[in-house]
């Protein structure tokens, strides 16, 4: 049997027999455009496509609309996979979204959404989420219903302010809302009372900036 040489996501990579964590090249069906993504082949059954990771503050997340569209950073470290790829991928079949969080006290938590997709660029990559479970809060820290994506040069939030400029980073801001996983990275002991940090309100409350975050997706099967 001929080995499949192009994969749309890490679930396909996993099913092809590649079961080691690492960076893989993904290609959407009917496309020649490639992206490099980190695949988590160990967490919860394997085959997770990492679409965002924060871990050490090495990458600047205060980026433009275009940069968030195409992706930036290092897939082995801190990075954003890219709104366009994720939008196209999540509109081809049903995906789940898992958000894994770490605080500075050694605790970990997660939020799992049973259905996740992004609208097209014409609709500002609006986020759509359904069915929250997990340990990082009973209420969704991503405002529901979902908001349009905003960046420092594309103000699509519901605020009279510019949330992305005020809080830094591109995110699905409301006015401005209970989360921002793309905010400023603050080191330990400087991570409290921060208005523009890495925020997941319904786990750690206001002003607490997290140590690490990972957003990962996988087909719902």
């Amino acid at each position: 049997k001929e080995e499949q040489i192009s994969f749309r996501d890490c679930a396909e990579v996993f099913k092809s027999g590649h079961t080691t964590n690492g960076v893989y090249t993904l290609t959407l069906p009917n496309s020649t455009e490639e992206v490099k993504a980190y695949c988590d082949m160990e967490a919860g059954g394997g085959g997770w496509t990492i679409i965002q990771r924060r871990e050490d503050g090495s990458v600047d997340f205060q980026r433009t609309w275009k940069e968030y569209k195409v992706g930036f950073g290092n897939p082995s470290g801190e990075y954003w996979l890219g709104n366009e790829f994720v939008s196209q991928l999540t509109n081809q079949q049903r995906y789940v979204l898992k958000i894994h969080l770490k605080d500075w006290e050694g605790n970990e938590a997660y939020s799992l959404y049973e259905h996740f997709y992004l609208s097209s660029e014409e609709l500002n990559y609006r986020i759509h989420l359904k069915g929250l479970t997990g340990t990082a809060g009973k209420i969704s820290s991503i405002s529901q219903p979902g908001n349009d994506f905003s960046t420092k040069d594309a103000d699509n939030d519901k605020c009279i302010c510019k949330c992305s400029q005020m809080l830094t980073g591109g995110w699905w801001f409301d006015a401005c809302g209970p989360s921002n996983l793309n905010g400023m990275y603050y080191p330990q002991r400087q991570n409290t009372n921060k208005f523009n940090g890495i925020k997941w309100y319904y786990w750690k409350g206001s002003g607490y900036s997290l140590k690490g975050t990972t957003m990962m997706i996988r087909p719902a099967d």
């Epitope: 820290s141 519901k158 605020c159 009279i160 302010c161 949330c163 005020m166 006015a175 401005c176 809302g177 209970p178 009372n193 921060k194 208005f195 309100y201 319904y202 206001s206 002003g207």
Partner: nanobody
Framework: EVQLVESGGGSVQAGGSLRLSCAAS????????IGWFRQAPGKEREGVSC????????NYADSVKGRFTISSDTAKNTVYLQMNSLKPEDTAVYYC???????????????????????????WGQGTQVTVSS
């Protein structure tokens, strides 16, 4: 560094009054809305009232409307919560908190309102205890 210091809490009989004060420092007072939240034992924290001194926007929880009044003194960088006709169910720790006044929707501005959603507030004081006995 942002600091919010509450005072004025204490014990009072039902029907009595208290005035809480929140002294703010470390930021431009006029650029922020100040909120009061409370948390009773075993209950979720809830919004009580807020004020934006720059435009006088206020908001009150339904449970305190007509009984509590919020006001600010910009010269002293202080916000006051006058609590009248107190009830046993007002017993809680009361927290003062701050959020940039611009962090509002156009609809809120039109309605002259500030946030009572606690996730919008970045800075919190240590709290002051209010006990109302019957």
């Amino acid at each position: 560094e942002v600091q919010l210091v509450e005072s004025g809490g204490g014990s009072v009989q039902a029907g009595g009054s208290l005035r809480l004060s929140c002294a703010a420092s470390g930021f431009t007072f006029d650029d922020y809305a100040i909120g009061w939240f409370r948390q009773a034992p075993g209950k979720e924290r809830e919004g009580v009232s807020c004020i934006s001194s720059s435009d006088g926007s206020t908001n009150y929880a339904d449970s305190v409307k007509g009984r509590f009044t919020i006001s600010s003194d910009t010269a002293k960088n202080t916000v006051y919560l006058q609590m009248n006709s107190l009830k046993p169910e007002d017993t809680a720790v009361y927290y003062c908190t701050a959020v940039p006044a611009t962090r509002r929707t156009p609809q809120m501005v039109d309605a002259n309102m500030c946030w009572l959603a606690e996730y919008e507030y970045d800075y919190w004081g240590q709290g002051t205890q209010v006990t109302v006995s019957s």
